[in-house]
């Protein structure tokens, strides 16, 4: 988790002098509770936006937006703590809006936004906005939270972001797999425009089961420049196991931008269709 272009952070708006500060996610009001605390945020919304860095890179960001309730507690609102928690790693990043002037009611509802938390493809986040100071131990909560899942790199808009392109999202191998005679598979895919090696991972399964009955790895050396964007054809020999008929072929590239953590592409060959009609039973069964 990180912030995009840290220098450009602003939270001031007409009628409010405000500064954005780094936060330890442990506001002072936890340790020294105040008697009077503001009410919770209203209408918290989290949206996926895309933002360019000053270097021109494009990143997905969490756009956080909320409004204030129209009650007298606005007089005791000193700021807000914005927290983003990545759910699979428990990593948390916080910033604090510090109000440098007192808020006053005006003709329209106060609205705040922040779009500087960089989020990762295919990751889920819990976004929380805490009004400050935080409530006393048994006080009513004055925060709002939302969970938010970022699309993966296959999503059309995500595909062109810097983190996705770095992991090879623009490469479309257009894998085809055909079953040949004599227990063989012919795998064909389009090479990318980089002199890097590939690995084909074959995993075979019985018809309706998910435990593998055969695994094989095939190394493809780095192509020469004249082979870029050409089709690579590989024939894989299968193990002659009856019923080991569903094959998953996965292609792992080793691009320089993502090394052994590049996006993999896969294709599956299903087991041949079983005939719908059972074999006819003869009228009589011979005894010998």
């Amino acid at each position: 988790l990180r912030l995009l272009d840290h220098r450009a952070l602003v939270c001031s708006q007409p009628g409010l002098n405000c500064t954005v500060k780094n936060s330890t996610c442990l506001d002072d009001s936890w340790i020294h509770p105040r008697n009077l605390t503001p009410s919770s945020p209203k209408d918290l919304q989290i949206q996926l936006h895309f933002a360019h860095t000053q270097q021109g890179d494009l990143f997905p960001v969490a756009h956080i937006e909320w409004t204030l309730q129209t009650d007298a507690s606005i007089l005791y609102l000193e700021g807000a703590e914005l927290s983003v928690l990545q759910l699979n790693t428990n990593e948390r990043l916080c910033v604090r809006f510090e109000f440098l002037s007192k808020l006053r009611h005006h003709h329209r509802r106060w609205r705040f936004t922040f779009s500087h938390f960089v989020v990762d493809p295919d990751q889920e986040y819990e976004v929380t906005v805490h009004h400050l100071p935080k409530p006393i131990p048994d006080g009513d909560p004055n925060h709002q939270s939302k969970n938010f899942l970022v699309p993966d790199c296959e999503h059309a808009r995500m595909k062109v972001t810097t983190p996705c392109m770095s992991s090879g999202s623009l490469w479309d191998p257009n894998i085809t797999v055909e079953t040949l005679e004599a227990h063989q598979l012919r795998v064909s895919f389009t090479l990318w425009n980089e002199s890097t090696h590939y690995q084909i991972l074959l995993t075979s399964f019985p018809h309706m089961e998910n435990h593998s009955c055969f695994e094989h790895m095939h190394h493809i050396p780095a192509p020469r420049p004249e082979e870029f964007h050409q089709r690579s054809n590989v024939t894989l020999t299968l193990r002659n196991l009856k019923g080991c008929c569903r094959h998953q072929v996965q292609i792992q590239p080793f691009f320089s931008s993502c090394l052994n953590d590049c996006l993999r592409h896969s294709a599956t060959v299903s087991c041949p269709e079983m005939p719908d009609t059972p074999e006819p039973i003869p009228d009589y069964m011979p005894l010998w």
């Epitope: 919304q45 709002q144 969970n147 699309p151």
Partner: nanobody, 127 residues
């Protein structure tokens, strides 16, 4: 014009099945997560199920888990809700809704994450 049109509702006996469909138009359907929300007669809105842009993740309200299945066909710009083992408490007006942003609201109150709602299709469960 951005539009969601639900169909497939009707009168069904308890324990039977029904399949709701939602036809989307006017936006890039395969960019957005979609949800089903229902409103029982005389009650408030209740989120039923959600699905990510490519169907990679599906979530369900506890009250329908194991009985309802959400799915989508991006080639047909369509969202579906297969409802099995229907109960009297499933009777409601079912809405197909689109997320406002490209992400997926996966927890907390999501109603303000939705920007386009269909007109709804009525499901009545009665013997």
């Amino acid at each position: 014009e951005v539009q969601l049109v639900e169909s497939g509702g009707g009168l069904v006996q308890p324990g039977r099945s029904l399949r709701l469909s939602c036809a989307a138009s006017g936006f890039s359907f395969d960019d957005y997560a979609m949800h089903w929300v229902r409103q029982p007669p005389g009650k408030g809105l209740e989120w039923v199920s959600g699905i990510t842009w490519n169907g990679g993740r599906k979530d369900y309200a506890d009250s329908v888990k194991g009985r309802f299945t959400i799915s989508r066909d991006n080639a047909k710009n369509s969202l579906y809700l297969q409802m099995n083992s229907l109960r009297a408490e499933d009777a409601a007006l079912y809405y197909c809704v689109k997320e406002r942003s490209l992400g997926y609201c996966s927890g907390g109150s999501c109603s303000d994450a939705f920007d386009i709602w269909g007109q709804g299709t009525m499901v009545t469960v009665s013997s």
